[in-house]
């Protein structure tokens, strides 16, 4: 296993609709054809997997149908979008990139993006 540098923004504020997007960029040492991207959430010293996708270079990222993540890739950059976020989902979102094929296997873990989420104000009752 060889180390690889992964860069991501330090802080992102989610939209009022609970959507946060950020780019995860990795310094690919070679010509990988198969890449796996995993988003981990660290909060209160606990790390949980948010979503993961394996893709072939040049193709779209495919997350599971029930995933809260979507993404696109361009060269050594992956643009990740996490949807359906609530205030309780505030935390450090870490991008993990694995170059699966061809060998050698490379692993890179970013420093994390602190995503802040605020629950939207409830709409005032109306008479309609």
């Amino acid at each position: 296993c060889k180390a690889m540098h992964v860069a991501q923004p330090a802080v992102v504020l989610a939209s009022s609709r609970g959507i946060a997007s950020f780019v995860c960029e990795y310094a690919s040492p070679g010509k990988a054809t198969e890449v796996r991207v995993t988003v981990l959430r660290q909060a209160d010293s606990q790390v949980t997997e948010v979503c993961a996708a394996t893709y072939m270079m040049g193709n779209e990222l495919t997350f599971l149908d029930d995933s809260i993540c979507t993404g696109t890739s361009s060269g050594n950059q992956v643009n990740l979008t996490i949807q359906g976020l609530r205030a309780m989902d505030t935390g450090l979102y870490i991008c993990k990139v694995e170059l699966m094929y061809p060998p050698p296997y490379y692993l890179g873990i970013g420093n994390g993006t602190q995503i802040y989420v605020i629950d939207p104000e409830p709409c005032p009752d109306s008479d309609f």
């Epitope: 923004p9 330090a10 802080v11 992102v12 504020l13 989610a14 939209s15 009022s16 997007s21 950020f22 909060a43 209160d44 205030a87 505030t90 450090l92 602190q114 802040y116 989420v117 605020i118």
Partner: antibody, heavy 117, light 108 residues
Framework: QVQLVQSGAEVKKPGASVKVSCKAS????????IGWVRQAPGQGLELMGW????????NYAQKLQGRVTMTTDTSTNTAYMELRSLRSDDTAVYYC??????????WGQGTTVTVSS | EIVMTQSPATLSLSPGERATLSCRAS???????LSWYQQKPGQAPRLLIY???TRATGIPARFSGSGSGTDFTLTISSLQPEDFAVYYC?????????FGPGTKVDIK
């Protein structure tokens, strides 16, 4: 080195608007947020809100909602805070600070805004 | 919003003495998101401690932070003349971020 440099002191009349700038250097501007904190004479620190330089999303203090607007210009690595309908109790020193998640680690030198008729 | 309270409001001590400042949150705050700042008259605040216990760059070892949940403490082991200032705690665990009202450490 990492620094934030703010615009100069302002004297405004009640009802007017003020726009304070904060120019960042020495780091990747879009990787962090910029918070705006004010301090009235002899008082503590009050967070007015902050902006994510990465995407422009903002979070304002409830008491200032509708009067404050925070923006960024990523081409010049500059953040702006505009406060409208100024009142005498808006007289304060206004600071910008870098938001990183786990403390505001870099602060501007402060901009004194005086509201007086 | 999370309300931060600090005690005492003023602490009168002599150089060389130990200072213990308290900060309490109205609800539990992850220690990763609790910071302490120092502010001297006419100056911008300066980050002292983040993550409840990690000293910021260039901060002397006499400053230390501790605590978890709702109760946090800033300790200055031996006060130096330049340490007399106002100290603020702040949480950025939940939006909106909030500051405590400050503790003034002055010379006895």
């Amino acid at each position: 080195q990492v620094q934030l440099v703010q615009s100069g002191a302002e004297v405004k009349k009640p009802g007017a608007s003020v726009k304070v700038s904060c120019k960042a250097s020495g780091y990747t501007f879009t990787s962090y947020g910029i918070g705006w904190v004010r301090q009235a004479p002899g008082q503590g620190l009050e967070l007015m809100g902050w902006i994510s330089a990465y995407n422009g999303n903002t979070n304002y203090a409830q008491k200032l909602q509708g009067r404050v607007t925070m923006t960024t210009d990523t081409s010049t690595n500059t953040a702006y805070m505009e406060l409208r309908s100024l009142r005498s109790d808006d007289t304060a020193v206004y600071y910008c600070a870098r938001v990183r998640g786990g403390g505001m680690d870099v602060w501007g030198q402060g901009t004194t805004v005086t509201v007086s008729s | 919003e999370i309300v931060m309270t600090q005690s005492p409001a003023t602490l009168s001590l002599s150089p060389g003495e130990r200072a213990t400042l308290s900060c309490r949150a109205s609800q539990s705050v992850s220690s990763s998101y609790l910071s302490w700042y120092q502010q001297k008259p006419g100056q911008a605040p300066r980050l002292l401690i983040y993550g409840a216990s990690t000293r910021a760059t260039g901060i002397p070892a006499r400053f230390s932070g501790s605590g978890s949940g709702t109760d946090f403490t800033l300790t200055i082991s031996s006060l130096q003349p330049e340490d007399f200032a106002v100290y603020y705690c702040q949480q950025d665990y939940n939006l909106p971020f909030t500051f405590g009202p400050g503790t003034k450490v002055d010379i006895k």
